[in-house]
C-alpha cells in the first residue's frame, strides 16, 4: 500500500496575537514535514517465482517502494521496457489491465504491487537467465524500473528474494526541480521550527500520532518492502544455455522443460495503443491522459487521450505503420 | 537442430527493393518467445542491428534506417522475410538473420548470411 | 543511441598467453544487477558466434578459457590461455535499449 505519512491534526489557535496568519505558520511547517519524510529515493523491486503446484506457471510480482502516484506499470520479458523485448501486460490504475500471452493474469496486489502469472508450458518456460521487468511511471519521481529473474534452483515454490533496483533511472528532468523544492522546503522547514523553539508547542490531538511517526511510518512501507530494500544482489550463473534452449536442460531440469505444443490459431493481440508506447528514455513528464509517449525503435499504433482497452480486432497488425500511421 | 538460411538477390541497383528471405527449421514461430532478428555487415566493417520480430508479431527497427524496413514473417513456412527500400551502394554487405529465444534479447543461432551487392 | 567502444582496435597474443578485451559503453546498460551486454566471436567467412549473454553466462559450447565480466558501462572478455583457434574478432553488443548497437570489433591475433 502507498505510505503517507499522517499530518497530526492541529487544535485552531487560540484568538488573540496568532489569528489566521498563525494558523498558517502552524500548519505549514507540517506540511512540509510531511513532505520531507515521504520524499526518499523511490525503487522497484522485482520477484519471480515458478509455482510449486503448476509448474509451468510462474508469477512475477513487482512493486514501488515511493510515495508518488503511479500512472502506469509495465512488465517486459527479455529486458527493459522499450528495449525491444516482449510486453507482457499494462496496468493503468483507472484505464484497467492489459495482458498478452504467455501472460495468464495480471492484477494489481496494492495500490503500489502488481502481480502477473505467466503460463510457461515448455518451450515458451523462462530458463534462470530470462529477466522480467517492471517499470512503474509515478508523479512525481517519474519513471523507475527494476529487473529479476528465476532463481538459478529449480526447485518448485522457491523464489528468488524480491530484487531491489539500487541504480534507477529518473526519466524526468523534473525530478531535480522537484527535488530542489523539497530541499528548500525542509530547510525553511529547520528555520520555521528554529523560530517556533521557544514558543508553547501547538497543542495535538490526542487520538493522533506523534510527530515522530510519520517517519518511522514513511521509511517503512511494510516488512516484505523493507526485506527488499536490503537483499544484496546475487549473480545468476545457470547452466541454462542459450544454444540448447530447444532440447533437454542440461543436468536434467525441471520438469517443465518440455517442448511447447504449437498453436498455429493463436493470434495474439498487438498491444493496445494506450499500452504499446512506452515512456520515453529522457524527456519531460507526459501525462498518461495525454495520449501516451512514442518509443524510437517501435512502429506505435495511433494514440491519443480517448483510447479504450478494448483489444484492436486488426490484431498484431495494429503496430504496423509509422508513428501509427496505417 | 537449428539452422537459419538466408537467401536474397545478389546483386541490385540503387533505388531498388531489396527483398531477403530467412528460411528455419529446428525451432518455430508459434512458440512463446521466439523471435528472429536481422543484422548486417559491410565487407570488413562491424555488424548493424536492424530489426527483429517476435512470435506474437511485435517488431522492432533500428532508427536510423526504420523508415525503409519492413520485416515479416510467415510461420507456417517457418520463414521471416525482411525488405528494404531505396537501396544505395551503402546497403551492400552481408545480412545475417539470428534466432532469438526464450523472449531473450540475444542473437543465439545465426545463418551464414547472404552477400548483397549494389552496383550503378 | 549508446555507443559501444571496444579496444584495443586489435592485439596480438602469445599462444598460452592472456587476451583482454574491452567495450565500453557510452551509457550504462544494467539494470539491477543484469547487464544487458553480449559477446561474439567471428572467424573469417563465418557468422559471429554468441560467447557470453548478460555479460558473463558463457554460452553453450564456448570452452572454459572464455570469461566475461564488467557491469554499467566497463566490460571485458578474457581469454586465457588464448589457443591457435581464438584467433577471430570479438565483438560486443548490448540490448538495454534500441537500438541495439555492436562494438566495433578486436580482431586477436595469435603470435
Known amino acids: 500500500m502507498r505510505t503517507e505519512a499522517q499530518v497530526p491534526a492541529l487544535q485552531p489557535p487560540e484568538p488573540g496575537l496568532e489569528g489566521a496568519m498563525g494558523h498558517r505558520t502552524l500548519v505549514l511547517p507540517w506540511v512540509l514535514l510531511t513532505l520531507c519524510v515521504t520524499a526518499g529515493t523511490p525503487e522497484v523491486w522485482v520477484q519471480v517465482r515458478m509455482e510449486a503446484t503448476e509448474l509451468s506457471s510462474f508469477t512475477i510480482r513487482c512493486g514501488f517502494l515511493g510515495s508518488g502516484s503511479i500512472s502506469l506499470v509495465t512488465v517486459s520479458w527479455g529486458g527493459p521496457n522499450g528495449a525491444g523485448g516482449t510486453t507482457l501486460a499494462v496496468l493503468h490504475p483507472e484505464r484497467g489491465i492489459r495482458q498478452w500471452a504467455p501472460a495468464r493474469q495480471a492484477r494489481w496486489e496494492t495500490q503500489s504491487s502488481i502481480s502477473l502469472i505467466l503460463e510457461g508450458s515448455g518451450a515458451s518456460s523462462p530458463c534462470a537467465n530470462t529477466t522480467f521487468c517492471c517499470k512503474f511511471a509515478s508523479f512525481p519521481e517519474g519513471s523507475w524500473e527494476a529487473c529479476g529473474s528465476l532463481p538459478p534452483s529449480s526447485d518448485p515454490g522457491l523464489s528468488a528474494p524480491p530484487t531491489p533496483a539500487p541504480i534507477l533511472r529518473a526519466d524526468l528532468a523534473g525530478i531535480l526541480g522537484v527535488s530542489g523544492v523539497l530541499l528548500f522546503g525542509c530547510v525553511y522547514l529547520l528555520h520555521l521550527l528554529r523560530r517556533h523553539k521557544h514558543r508553547p508547542a501547538p497543542r495535538l490531538q490526542p487520538s493522533r500520532t506523534s510527530p515522530q511517526a510519520p517517519r518511522a511510518r514513511a521509511w517503512a512501507p511494510s516488512q516484505a518492502s523493507q526485506a527488499a530494500l536490503h537483499v544484496p544482489y546475487a549473480t545468476i550463473n545457470t547452466s541454462c544455455r542459450p544454444a540448447t534452449l530447444d532440447t533437454a536442460h542440461p543436468h536434467g531440469g525441471p520438469s517443465w522443460w518440455a517442448s511447447l505444443p504449437t498453436h498455429a490459431a493463436h493470434r495474439p493481440q498487438g498491444p493496445a495503443a494506450w499500452a504499446s508506447t512506452p515512456i520515453p528514455a529522457r524527456g519531460s513528464f507526459v501525462s498518461v491522459e495525454n495520449g501516451l509517449y512514442a518509443q524510437a525503435g517501435e512502429r506505435p499504433p495511433h494514440t491519443g487521450p480517448g483510447l479504450t482497452l478494448f483489444p484492436d480486432p486488426r490484431g498484431p497488425r495494429a503496430m504496423e505503420g509509422p508513428l501509427g500511421v496505417r | 537442430q537449428v539452422t537459419l538460411k538466408e537467401s536474397g538477390p545478389g546483386i541490385l541497383q540503387p533505388s531498388q527493393t531489396l527483398s531477403l528471405t530467412c528460411s528455419f527449421s529446428g525451432f518455430s514461430l508459434n512458440t512463446s518467445g521466439t523471435g528472429v532478428g536481422w543484422i548486417r555487415q559491410p565487407s570488413g566493417k562491424g555488424l548493424e542491428w536492424l530489426t527483429h520480430?517476435?512470435?506474437?508479431?511485435?517488431?522492432f527497427y533500428n532508427t536510423f534506417l526504420k523508415s525503409r524496413l519492413t520485416i515479416s514473417k510467415e510461420t507456417s513456412n517457418n520463414q521471416v522475410f525482411l525488405k528494404i527500400a531505396s537501396v544505395d551502394t551503402a546497403d551492400a554487405a552481408t545480412y545475417y538473420c539470428?534466432?532469438?529465444?526464450?523472449?531473450?534479447?540475444?542473437?543465439?543461432?545465426w545463418g551464414q548470411g547472404t552477400l548483397v551487392a549494389v552496383s550503378t | 543511441d549508446i555507443v559501444l567502444t571496444q579496444s584495443p582496435a586489435s592485439l596480438a597474443v602469445s599462444l598460452g598467453q592472456r587476451a583482454s578485451i574491452s567495450c565500453r559503453a557510452s551509457?550504462?546498460?544494467?539494470?539491477?544487477?543484469?547487464?544487458?551486454m553480449y559477446w561474439y566471436q567471428q572467424k573469417p567467412g563465418q557468422p559471429p558466434r554468441l560467447l557470453f549473454y548478460l555479460a558473463s553466462n558463457l554460452a553453450s559450447g564456448v570452452p572454459a578459457r572464455f570469461s566475461g565480466s564488467g557491469s554499467g558501462t566497463d566490460f571485458t572478455l578474457n581469454i586465457h590461455p588464448v589457443e591457435e583457434e581464438d584467433a577471430a574478432i570479438y565483438y560486443c553488443q548490448h540490448s538495454r535499449e534500441l537500438p541495439y548497437t555492436f562494438g566495433g570489433g578486436t580482431k586477436l591475433e595469435i603470435k
Open positions: 539470428a534466432r532469438m529465444a526464450y523472449g531473450n534479447l540475444w542473437f543465439v543461432n
Open positions: 520480430i517476435w512470435w506474437n508479431d511485435n517488431k
Open positions: 551509457r550504462s546498460v544494467t539494470i539491477s544487477g543484469y547487464s544487458y
